[in-house]
Amino acid sequence: AGHLEQPQISSTKTLSKTARLECVVSGITISATSVYWYRERPGEVIQFLVSISYDGTVRKESGIPSGKFEVDRIPETSTSTLTIHNVEKQDIATYYCALWEV
């Protein structure tokens, strides 16, 4: 079974800068899985943001601007990254990665 670790406990960024979050996959080949990213804003329900599937297909939540989030995966380090562009106060949240094993 696959295991996920998000090594960054927290990330502090200046407004308008870029934040990059990592999710390390172990126990399974990242190229054979789909990785999903969610966020939980304070006091709000958890929300799907974006996913990257085994074949590289990227899906994002409707209504999220196309340039706001980027998702990628690096097979060499078995890592998925979520990039948050133009960081705003509304981006303050806990970000979770999740795994779907194909």
């Epitope: 599937s53 074949d55 590289g56 297909t57 990227v58 899906r59 196309s66 340039g67």
Partner: nanobody
């Protein structure tokens, strides 16, 4: 609403090249991931290539890898498909399509919000 118009199709000999273009009008072009599909007579519509919202990621069907190149110009609202080393089996009607929420080879045709009318590509042997 987005209107997509393809151009650049035609008749070419095997081994030749064509460049297809798709021009979008309407809402912000960069909000859409773009894809090219093709449909040969009597066959299902199949994925050819796609490009992400920013243009930073491209995807190709195995049958066209190394021969076709997809690119986009968000300033000009266009996406192009450069097709080299064409083969008779590339003969089909080629469609461009736009998706707000999906980018890549796994996007179902239903995940594309807008489609062009298609342009015919014929490769003779």
């Amino acid at each position: 609403e987005v209107q997509l118009v393809e151009s650049g199709g035609g008749l070419v000999q095997a081994g030749g090249s064509l460049r297809l273009s798709c021009t979008a009008s309407g809402r912000t072009f960069s909000s859409y991931a773009m894809g090219w599909f093709r449909q040969a007579p009597g066959k299902e519509r199949e994925f050819v290539a796609a490009i992400s919202w920013s243009g930073g990621t491209t995807y190709y069907a195995d049958s066209v890898k190394g021969r076709f190149t997809i690119s986009r110009d968000n300033a000009k609202n266009t996406v192009s498909l450069q097709m080299n080393s064409l083969k008779p089996e590339d003969t089909a009607v080629y469609f461009c399509a736009a998706s707000l929420d999906c980018s890549g080879p796994g996007c179902h045709t239903a995940e594309y919000d807008y489609w062009g009318q298609g342009t015919q590509v014929t490769v003779s042997s």
